[in-house]
């Protein structure tokens, strides 16, 4: 059984200051742990690079919306 108590927590300490094109983004995950200094979004790009972003920024929210909508599109 994995030890959830000692599971490592991923935190973001700095945010990207560049807007990333949604075409380069594959997915995202939210960082909401109280063990982290900041609420954050981690975008994963199509080349598997992870980028920390500020969830308060509109482009970040719009990018999450775009990725969410893609999950409802049936894959053919």
């Amino acid at each position: 059984q994995p030890d959830a108590i000692n599971a490592p927590v991923t935190c973001c300490y700095n945010f990207t200051n560049r807007k990333i094109s949604v075409q380069r983004l594959a997915s995202y995950r939210r960082i909401t742990s109280s063990k982290c200094p900041k609420e954050a979004v981690i975008f994963k790009t199509i080349v598997a690079k992870e980028i920390c972003a500020d969830p308060k920024q509109k482009w970040v929210q719009d990018s999450m919306d775009h990725l969410d909508k893609q999950t409802q599109t049936p894959k053919t």
């Epitope: 995950r29 939210r30 909508k69």
Partner: nanobody, 123 residues
């Protein structure tokens, strides 16, 4: 941590209307996808409606499409569900949820849930 508090439920006659509200404590409310789900007695929790962070995209279950409208006010940290032409089969506990993970209508992609508000539609 996001706290969600629903209100506006109650007893209404078939054909009537109710407006549910869900107030969120999140400082970054506009960064969460918001959804409404419901659970009738002896039934599974089911998706009702979802609204994107911008409010520009919405999606409804077939059972409520054309009768229910989801909306949000990011300045007030609140999401609404306007329910018109209510039917007895709409009777359920209605839950508001905030989606922090990638997804759309799937309950498993919603991380934060309210306690629910009871809606009873009598015939």
């Amino acid at each position: 941590e996001v706290q969600l508090v629903e209100s506006g439920g109650g007893l209404v006659q078939a054909g009537g209307s109710l407006r549910l509200s869900c107030a969120a404590s999140a400082r970054t409310f506009s960064s969460y996808r918001m959804g409404w789900f419901r659970q009738a007695p002896e039934k599974e929790r089911e998706f009702v409606a979802v609204i994107s962070r911008s409010g520009g995209d919405t999606f409804y279950s077939n059972s409520v499409k054309g009768r229910f409208t989801i909306s949000r006010d990011n300045a007030k940290n609140t999401v609404y569900l306007q329910m018109n032409s209510l039917k007895p089969e709409d009777t359920a506990v209605y839950y508001c949820a905030a989606g922090a993970q990638i997804g759309w209508a799937e309950a498993s992609t919603y991380d934060y849930w309210g306690q629910g508000t009871q809606v009873t539609v009598s015939s």
